[in-house]
């Protein structure tokens, strides 16, 4: 009888260990990626930033994948996504073709199954950066709550990439899972 | 036999109550701190803001500590940190020392063990606040996901503190724990 | 005896199913509401934006209610609230009434029990949108962590609604529950 009870308890314990694991949401996915500002291509009004750090400084990733410049979702869920993008220019950096700048960020989602890209969030500002001032700076922050499916990819596009602030505290994006999909 | 079963069940119940508590992450820490307008430093230089409300209006704190102008982490974990900083100037307040302003926020982390300070997030903008307009306003928002250890301290530095908007809906910062460290 | 053990186990299982449900925070409430561009008020005055999508594109809602232009809380808790508001103007849209603009957002909470409205968060900027540039753009992002009670309502007010960017990736607000109230 005692043996039987232990077996029953083991079943209970086992099922609740599973539940406990699930209550931690399979080790809740997250990522915080900081800019690697080397070798950003040009040629379009907005360019995709493909080089980010995920394993140094503030950069980190867990239960998500970073590949080919994209943050890949490994686990279905609702995620809070965010991005902080800083632009700057100093007179010693050379001139600007125009004082009127469009400083923008676009957080996009790509589905591999249906090869299409959609903008989830955008932000930014048109700025008048006059040569009368030796230094200019501007930051954008966007954030929002989105349903993401395994295999979907998040990427960051910006205008004027040559003006990006390359500091890890300045230009970054990230995600963390908040809850499962019902 | 029945007594023995109850004892077994109590053991199961006990362990799961612990698990339940842990699944609530020991009452998940958070803080939302609003600016204390009576104690804003003057000047245009970069300063640490040390006076915040944690127990009135929107200000609140739980399982974190506020001391000496710093938000102290009591529980290891991954936290979402955020700050919203508003600057404003009205012509009735007198002239600005310069029309070219650098309005910035820096969210910093200090480790007591290794007495060093690191900027986690920065944001802001250079602004030209001309005398042609009677009122000027600008807000910065930053947010990001960071690993914080017990004893580490979060503080806020700004430039031009004398231009801060003292409203609780304008100038605040906060944190909430999202998940444990594996 | 074996029957009795099963009954005991069922009790354990039942109570833990409740706990499991609770550990999912009764299906954690959230909302992400995107602007309904067909119904944006005109003018430059401060207005409440009452028309949002909750069931198309990125718009979604769960365990919260959207009614009369307000996001209604159904479940007590601590929530992270956010808003992203984009303003834009192209010269082809005609002249602006003034080049000096105040582009602002206010996230407000209304309690029906005590019929009063309070601003939780505000952000924005004064802008000089000169005719020398053909296009102007500006985005605001605010976010913060707030205690919300069932029945309380969240709404968005902006200045210069006629300048709002009607894209779903541009102008939106949302909320997600992070934890219970102790």
């Amino acid at each position: 009888g005692s043996q039987h009870i232990r077996a029953e308890k083991a079943m209970v314990d086992g099922s609740w260990l599973d539940l406990a694991k699930r209550s931690k949401l399979e080790a809740q996915p997250f990522a915080h990626l900081t800019i690697n500002a080397t070798d950003i291509p040009s040629g379009s009004h907005k360019v995709s930033l493909s080089s980010w750090y995920h394993d140094r400084g503030w950069g980190k990733i867990s239960n998500m994948t970073f590949s080919n410049g994209k943050l890949i979702v490994n686990q279905d869920g609702f995620y809070y996504l965010y991005a902080n993008i800083c632009f700057r220019h100093h007179e010693t950096s050379g001139d600007l073709a125009t004082e009127y700048l469009q400083l923008m960020v676009y957080v996009t989602k790509t589905s591999i199954k249906i090869p299409s890209s959609h903008t989830l969030m955008k932000g930014g500002s048109t700025k008048y950066w006059s040569g009368n001032s030796e230094f200019h700076f501007y930051s954008i922050n966007v954030g929002g709550f989105f349903k993401l499916r395994s295999g979907e990819e998040i990427s960051i596009e910006v205008s004027n990439p040559s003006l990006l602030d390359p500091d890890q505290d300045a230009t970054y994006f990230g995600a963390f899972k908040v809850r499962d999909i019902d | 036999g029945s007594q023995h079963i109850r004892a077994e069940k109590a053991m199961v119940d006990g362990s799961w109550l612990d698990l339940a508590k842990r699944s609530k992450l020991e009452a998940q820490p958070f803080a939302h701190l609003t600016i204390n307008a009576t104690d804003i430093p003057s000047g245009s230089h970069k300063v640490s803001l040390s006076s915040w409300y944690h127990d009135r209006g929107w200000g609140k704190i739980s399982n974190m500590t506020f001391s000496n102008g710093k938000l102290i982490v009591n529980q290891d974990g991954f936290y979402y940190l955020y700050a919203n900083i508003c600057f404003r100037h009205h012509e009735t307040s007198g002239d600005l020392a310069t029309e070219y302003l650098q309005l910035m926020v820096y969210v910093t982390k200090t480790s007591i063990k290794i007495p060093s300070s690191h900027t986690l997030m920065k944001g802001g903008s250079t602004k030209y606040w001309s005398g042609n307009s009677e009122f000027h306003f600008y807000s910065i928002n930053v947010g990001g996901f960071f690993k914080l250890r017990s004893g580490e301290e979060i503080s806020i530095e700004v430039s031009n503190p004398s231009l801060l908007d003292p409203d609780q809906d304008a100038t605040y910062f906060g944190a909430f724990k999202v998940r444990d460290i594996d | 005896g074996s029957q009795h053990i099963r009954a005991e186990k069922a009790m354990v299982d039942g109570s833990w199913l409740d706990l499991a449900k609770r550990s999912k925070l009764e299906a954690q409430p959230f909302a992400h509401l995107t602007i309904n561009a067909t119904d944006i008020p005109s003018g430059s005055h401060k207005v409440s934006l009452s028309s949002w999508y909750h069931d198309r594109g990125w718009g979604k809602i769960s365990n919260m209610t959207f009614s009369n232009g307000k996001l209604i809380v159904n479940q007590d808790g601590f929530y992270y609230l956010y808003a992203n508001i984009c303003f834009r103007h192209h010269e082809t849209s005609g002249d602006l009434a003034t080049e000096y603009l105040q582009l602002m957002v206010y996230v407000t909470k209304t309690s029906i029990k005590i019929p009063s409205s309070h601003t939780l968060m505000k952000g924005g900027s004064t802008k000089y949108w000169s005719g020398n540039s053909e296009f102007h753009f500006y985005s605001i992002n605010v976010g913060g962590f707030f205690k919300l009670r069932s029945g309380e309502e969240i709404s968005i007010e902006v200045s210069n609604p006629s300048l709002l960017d009607p894209d779903q990736d541009a102008t939106y607000f949302g909320a997600f529950k992070v934890r219970d109230i102790d």
């Epitope: 291509p41 040009s42 050379g94 001139d95 125009t98 | - | -």
Partner: antibody, heavy 123, light 107 residues
Framework: EVQLVESGGDLVKPGGSLKLSCAAS????????MSWVRQTPDKRLEWVAS????????SYPDSVQGRFTITRDSAKNTLYLQMSSLKSEDTAMYYC????????????????WGAGTTVTVSS | DTVLTQSPATLSVTPGASVSLSCRAS??????LHWYQQKSHESPRLLII???QSISGIPSRFSGSGSGTDFTLSINSVETEDFGVYFC?????????FGGGTKLEIK
């Protein structure tokens, strides 16, 4: 039709000064950065000066820094290059060119060129 | 300064042949490279921007490729009107610099 027409080229002695002009038409002059590019007798191209659309940024290579000044008058749709302390190595065909970019305002390619004006520095 | 080296200095071809012109940068310039054509007694004309983007009004036989330090301008089936000098120019870093040019002449 988008057009740039340079004028003011001449024969000048070393140490002398000269002012070149470039009249722009067919596009909104005030919305573009502008540059001067010269072509030396050995057919090499050298960027000489740039000015931003609003005229607040100017830049020069080390070879002409302090001697050349680029300016613009958007009301007259005209670009200028004031050259002083001229040297024999400044002898070249001077082209006025419209500066353009797609991605970053720090970029620069020249999508419209004038026919050029000849500057000869010789004693 | 970023030095652009073009090769060959001169290329003799017969009309109808296809050719490749090289431009090498002294340091990585990503894709911030542009190509110009200059016919005898004319001003330069923009052909390709950002290494590979064609310009409106330029014949499709002109194409560009490359990234980093090595770039190529290709002309598929050269026509008589294509003879002249070809220059590359970088806009990755200040000051903007041009290559020495490749002269395409009739064989």
């Amino acid at each position: 039709e988008v057009q740039l027409v340079e004028s003011g080229g001449d024969l000048v002695k070393p140490g002398g000064s000269l002012k070149l002009s470039c009249a722009a038409s067919g596009f909104t002059f005030s919305r573009y950065g502008m540059s001067w590019v010269r072509q030396t007798p050995d057919k090499r191209l050298e960027w000489v000066a740039s000015i931003s659309s609003g005229g607040t940024y100017t830049s020069y290579p080390d070879s002409v820094q302090g001697r050349f000044t680029i300016t613009r008058d958007s009301a007259k749709n005209t670009l200028y290059l004031q050259m002083s302390s001229l040297k024999s190595e400044d002898t070249a065909m001077y082209y006025c060119a419209r500066r353009n970019f797609i991605t970053s305002a720090t970029d620069c390619y020249f999508d419209v060129w004038g026919a050029g004006t000849t500057v000869t520095v010789s004693s | 300064d970023t030095v652009l080296t073009q090769s060959p200095a001169t290329l003799s071809v017969t009309p109808g042949a296809s050719v490749s012109l090289s431009c090498r940068a002294s340091q990585s310039i990503s894709n911030n490279l542009h190509w110009y054509q200059q016919k005898s007694h004319e001003s330069p004309r923009l052909l390709i921007i950002y290494a590979s983007q064609s310009i409106s009004g330029i014949p499709s036989r002109f194409s560009g490729s490359g990234s980093g330090t090595d770039f190529t301008l290709s002309i598929n089936s050269v026509e008589t009107e294509d003879f002249g000098v070809y220059f590359c120019q970088q806009s990755n870093s200040w000051p903007f610099t041009f290559g020495g040019g490749t002269k395409l002449e009739i064989k």
